[in-house]
C-alpha cells in the first residue's frame, strides 16, 4: 500500500504563469540533410506559460514572447573522428501569460 | 530571415533535476462511472524530474518519490443545481533525480 499517507491538504490551482520547461534540441532543427552528428547540449531550459484557468472556455496563453538565439555545438563524426561546428537555435521564451478566451465556433446567424 | 535577433549566447544544458510541472486533474481520476460533474481545481503543481543527460544511453529518472494526497471538490450537476462533494487525489512528487542507464533490450541467448 506504499505506506500510510498524510492528511489531504486542499488542492491549490496551478495558476496561469510562466514556468521553466525543458526544450529538446532535435537534430532536424540543426541539419535536415544527414543524421550523422550529435548536438550539444541536447536540451535547454525555456520559459513557457502553463497552468489552468477558471473554465474550459479560457486557456493560459502567452501575451509577451521573446525569441532568444543560442549557440550549440554540432559534432560531426567523420572517419570516426569528431569535427566540431557551431549552429544557432532560436528559442521561444514566454515573458507574460493570461487566461484568454479560446477561439470558438461562431454561431451561424 | 524573418526578423533580426540579438547575438547568440552559448546554450546551457538543462540539467537533470526536479522542476515544477502542471498536473491536470482529469475527471476519470475522480469517478470513472459518470462524467456529469466538474472538478476544482482542474490542475495543480507537482515536482517532476526533467532535463537531459550526457548521452542517449542514460535518462533523467526520479530516485526518490513522495505521494501527496490533496483534496479536490467534485461538483455534481443534479437537476441543473450544483452539489458539492469532496474527493482525494494522490499526486506524485519527485524529490530527487539522477541520470540512470536505460534498460536496453537483453540479447536472446
Amino acid at each position: 500500500s506504499l505506506g500510510s499517507l498524510t492528511v489531504a491538504e486542499p488542492a491549490m490551482i496551478a495558476e496561469c504563469k510562466t514556468r521553466t520547461e525543458v526544450f529538446e534540441i532535435s537534430r532536424r532543427l540543426i541539419d535536415r540533410t544527414n543524421a550523422n552528428f550529435l548536438v550539444w547540449p541536447p536540451c535547454v531550459e525555456v520559459q513557457r506559460c502553463s497552468g489552468c484557468c477558471n473554465n474550459r472556455n479560457v486557456q493560459c496563453r502567452p501575451t509577451q514572447v521573446q525569441l532568444r538565439p543560442v549557440q550549440v555545438r554540432k559534432i560531426e563524426i567523420v572517419r570516426k573522428k569528431p569535427i566540431f561546428k557551431k549552429a544557432t537555435v532560436t528559442l521561444e521564451d514566454h515573458l507574460a501569460c493570461k487566461c484568454e478566451t479560446v477561439a470558438a465556433a461562431r454561431p451561424v446567424t | 530571415s524573418l526578423g533580426s535577433l540579438t547575438v547568440a549566447e552559448p546554450a546551457m544544458i538543462a540539467e537533470c533535476k526536479t522542476r515544477t510541472e502542471v498536473f491536470e486533474i482529469s475527471r476519470r481520476l475522480i469517478d470513472r462511472t459518470n462524467a456529469n460533474f466538474l472538478v476544482w481545481p482542474p490542475c495543480v503543481e507537482v515536482q517532476r524530474c526533467s532535463g537531459c543527460c550526457n548521452n542517449r544511453n542514460v535518462q533523467c529518472r526520479p530516485t526518490q518519490v513522495q505521494l501527496r494526497p490533496v483534496q479536490v471538490r467534485k461538483i455534481e450537476i443534479v437537476r441543473k443545481k450544483p452539489i458539492f462533494k469532496k474527493a482525494t487525489v494522490t499526486l506524485e512528487d519527485h524529490l530527487a533525480c539522477k541520470c540512470e542507464t536505460v534498460a536496453a533490450a537483453r540479447p536472446v541467448t
Epitope: 526544450f23 529538446e24 534540441i25 532535435s26 532536424r28 532543427l29 535536415r32 525555456v46 513557457r48 506559460c49 496563453r61 502567452p62 514572447v65 525569441l67 544557432t88 537555435v89 532560436t90 521561444e92 521564451d93 514566454h94 | 530571415s1 524573418l2
Partner: antibody, heavy 120, light 107 residues
Framework: EVQLVESGGGLVQPGGSLRLSCAAS????????MSWVRQAPEKGLEWVST????????YYADSVKGRFTISRDNAKNSLYLQMNSLRAEDTAVYYC?????????????WGQGTLVTVSS | DIQMTQSPSSLSASVGDRVTITCRAS??????LNWYQQKPGKAPKLLIY???SLQSGVPSRFSGSGSGTDFTLTISSLQPEDFATYYC?????????FGGGTKVEIK
C-alpha cells in the same frame, strides 16, 4: 517515423465553422514550429498559417486573417485550426505540416490531408 | 507579397532524361527557397531546402541551385517514380508563397 494525422474536415455551409485537428507522433512535437497548408481542387498549394513551437507566435495568410485561428497543445501533441465564417473559396484539402525551427519556414513532413467542402 | 513563377508549367520527358525546372522570385530571397514533389492524391514531400540542401532520404539525383531571384531544380536521370508535380516555395518572408507547379509527365 514521423506521422501527422489530420481530422475534422467535412461539408459545411457558407458562414459556418469547423475545427481541424492534427495528431503528431514520431518526433518531439513541442520542439517544432507547425503549419497548415491547403490545396483547392485541381489547384496549387497555398500557405494558411504557422505557429511557433511554444504557441506564442502565430502567422496567417491575408485570405484567412481574422477568420481562422491556429493553436496547439504540446501536452497532447496536437495542432488545431479553428475556421469561422467559412466561404466557398475555403474549399480545399487542408494539410498540417512540420515547419522546422524559427529560421526554416518550410514544410518538412506533411499529413495526408483532410477535405473541407464549403457549399450550400 | 513575393510572387513565385515556375516554368515550364508542364513538361514531357522519358526515363533517364535530365530534367530542369526553374523558379523565379519577384524580389531577391537570398537562398530561402524550398522544393516539393507531389504525386496525385498524395501529400507533398520536401525535396530540397535552402535552395540546395537535400532533405534526408531524398535520392541524390535531385539537386537544387540558385540564389537571389533565380533557382533551378534538376533531376539528373529521371526515374519512373519521379513523374509528379513539383512546387517551389519561398521562406524569406510572410506570407509564405508557392510557385504554380510544374507537372512532369511521361513522354
Amino acid at each position: 517515423e514521423v506521422q501527422l494525422v489530420e481530422s475534422g474536415g467535412g461539408l459545411v455551409q457558407p458562414g459556418g465553422s469547423l475545427r481541424l485537428s492534427c495528431a503528431a507522433s514520431g518526433f518531439t512535437f513541442s520542439s517544432y514550429w507547425m503549419s497548415w497548408v491547403r490545396q483547392a481542387p485541381e489547384k496549387g498549394l497555398e500557405w494558411v498559417s504557422t505557429i511557433s513551437d511554444g504557441g506564442g507566435l502565430t502567422y496567417y495568410a491575408d485570405s484567412v486573417k481574422g477568420r481562422f485561428t491556429i493553436s496547439r497543445d504540446n501536452a497532447k501533441n496536437s495542432l488545431y485550426l479553428q475556421m469561422n465564417s467559412l466561404r466557398a473559396e475555403d474549399t480545399a484539402v487542408y494539410y498540417c505540416a512540420e515547419s522546422g525551427g524559427y529560421t526554416d519556414w518550410l514544410f518538412g513532413y506533411w499529413g495526408q490531408g483532410t477535405l473541407v467542402t464549403v457549399s450550400s | 507579397d513575393i510572387q513565385m513563377t515556375q516554368s515550364p508549367s508542364s513538361l514531357s520527358a522519358s526515363v533517364g532524361d535530365r530534367v530542369t525546372i526553374t523558379c523565379r522570385a519577384s524580389q531577391s530571397i537570398s537562398s530561402y527557397l524550398n522544393w516539393y514533389q507531389q504525386k496525385p492524391g498524395k501529400a507533398p514531400k520536401l525535396l530540397i531546402y535552402a535552395a540546395s540542401s537535400l532533405q534526408s532520404g531524398v535520392p541524390s539525383r535531385f539537386s537544387g541551385s540558385g540564389s537571389g531571384t533565380d533557382f533551378t531544380l534538376t533531376i539528373s536521370s529521371l526515374q519512373p517514380e519521379d513523374f509528379a508535380t513539383y512546387y517551389c516555395q519561398q521562406s524569406y518572408s510572410t506570407p509564405l508563397t508557392f510557385g504554380g507547379g510544374t507537372k512532369v509527365e511521361i513522354k
